[in-house]
Interface confidence: medium
Amino acid sequence: DTEIKVNPPQDFEIVDPGYLGYLYLQWQPPLSLDNFKECTVEYELKYRNIGSETWTTIITKNLHYKDGFDLNKGIEAKIHTLLPWQCTNGSEVQSSWAEATYWISPQGIPETKVQDMDCVYYNWQYLLCSWKPGIGVLLDTNYNLFYWYEGLDRALQCVDYIKVDGQNIGCRFPYLESSDYKDFYICVNGSSETKPIRSSYFTFQLQNIVKPLPPVCLTCTQESLYEIKLKWSIPLGPIPARCFVYEIEIREDDTTLVTTTVENETYTLKITNETRQLCFVVRSKVNIYCSDDGIWSEWSDKQCWEVEELLKKTLLL
C-alpha cells in the first residue's frame, strides 16, 4: 500500500497590480499531477495582513484569487494542494504549504505620513477627503492622493486639490461612477526635497461615509386636541427615502427637550394643555438598510409654532 502524496502549488506569488491594496494571489498547478488526471484538484489558500491574529481561508479550484489588503502593513499567504477523498480512496490528502509574502518597502519615518485623514461623501454625491500634514516635515512637502475602485482600469490621481499654506491638504473628487458598495482604495504619498515621506493607505466603502443634507419643509399640524403631527421632506439628491433615519429634537415652551429617532418623515407628538409653544429640528442619516455606518447631517433650520394658532387652524378646518 503506497502512501499517496501530492506536491504544493508552484510559483505561488502575491502580485500588486497598482490598485493601492487590491492584490492578486496566483499560482500554478503542482508538479506530477499526471497520476490524478481524473481528479479535480483543489487548493486551500490562507492569507492575512502581518500582525493580524486570524487568517482568511479560501478553498478554490482556480489558480488565482483577488482581495483587498492594508498596504500600511505586510501581507503573508500560504497555500497547499488538496486531493479530495474521491481521488484517494477515502481520505483527503494535503500537500505541504507554499508560502509568499509582500510588503511595500517603506520610505521615510512613520511620523512624516499624513495625519487625521477624513473622508466624507456629501449627500451620496460629492466625495471630499482632507488630511493634516505629517510631523517633522518641512512646508516644502507636497502630498499627492491616488484612488482606485473596481471599475477603473488604473489608479487615478486627484485633479482638484485643496491647498493650505501652499500644501495639498485635501482632494475634491470628480463624479465617481458606480463606486458605492465596493472597496474604495486611497493612497496619500508625499514628496519633499529634504526627506523621504511615508505613504499612507486607506480603504472604505463610500455608502458608509455619507453625510446627507438636512431635511427640509418642516410642518406642524394639530391632529386632535392633544396630538400634533410633525412632518418634513427628504432632502434633494440621490438618496432614496427608504435609506433615511431621522433624529428629532423637540422643545416645548423652551424647557422640555425630547430627542427621538424615527424611520419615516412624520412624528406624532402628545402634548399637554399647558403647552404654549412647540419648536423642533430634524437631522438625517443613512440607515442600516442602506449602509453599515454614516454621518448625521447638520440640523435643519428650527421651526416653531404657537399651539393656540395650530388649534385655531384645526378648529377652522
Epitope: Q115, S130, I162, V164, I169, G170
Partner: nanobody, 115 residues
Framework: QVQLQESGGGLVQPGGSLRLSCTAS????????MAWGRQGPGKPRELIAT???????NYAESVKGRFTVSRDNAENTLYLQMNNLKSEDTAVYYC?????????WGQGTQVTVSS
C-alpha cells in the same frame, strides 16, 4: 478668523529649558489639530509637534523626548515645553491652528540657544 500670539521665547544656554505659549483670540475647543512649527536660519519652516482635540501628540524625531506639546482649551492656549535645548534648536517658533480646511499661523517668537 483665529488670531494666534506666541510668547516665551528668548536666549537660553545649551541644556536649558523654555516654555512657549500661544494664545488664541477665539475658542480653540473646536479646533482638532494644533501644532508648533519652527524655522531655523536659512531653512524652510518645519512642523515639530502636533496635538489633536483628544490630546494625542506627535513629535518630529529631532525633538522627541525633549519637547512636550500640551493645550488648555479653557484658557485657549497651546504650550511647548522645551528641555535640554541644543544650538540646532535656534529658530523662530510658530504656533499653527487648523480648523477644518483652514490654517492660521502666529507671528512667531525667537528662541536662541547659545553659550
Amino acid at each position: 478668523q483665529v488670531q494666534l500670539q506666541e510668547s516665551g521665547g528668548g536666549l537660553v544656554q545649551p541644556g536649558g529649558s523654555l516654555r512657549l505659549s500661544c494664545t488664541a483670540s477665539g475658542s480653540i475647543r473646536g479646533i482638532g489639530y494644533m501644532a508648533w512649527g519652527r524655522q531655523g536660519p536659512g531653512k524652510p519652516r518645519e512642523l515639530i509637534a502636533t496635538i489633536n482635540s483628544a490630546g494625542d501628540t506627535n513629535y518630529a524625531e529631532s525633538v522627541k523626548g525633549r519637547f512636550t506639546v500640551s493645550r488648555d482649551n479653557a484658557e485657549n492656549t497651546l504650550y511647548l515645553q522645551m528641555n535640554n535645548l541644543k544650538s540646532e534648536d535656534t529658530a523662530v517658533y510658530y504656533c499653527n491652528a487648523r480648523p477644518g480646511l483652514q490654517s492660521y499661523w502666529g507671528q512667531g517668537t525667537q528662541v536662541t540657544v547659545s553659550s
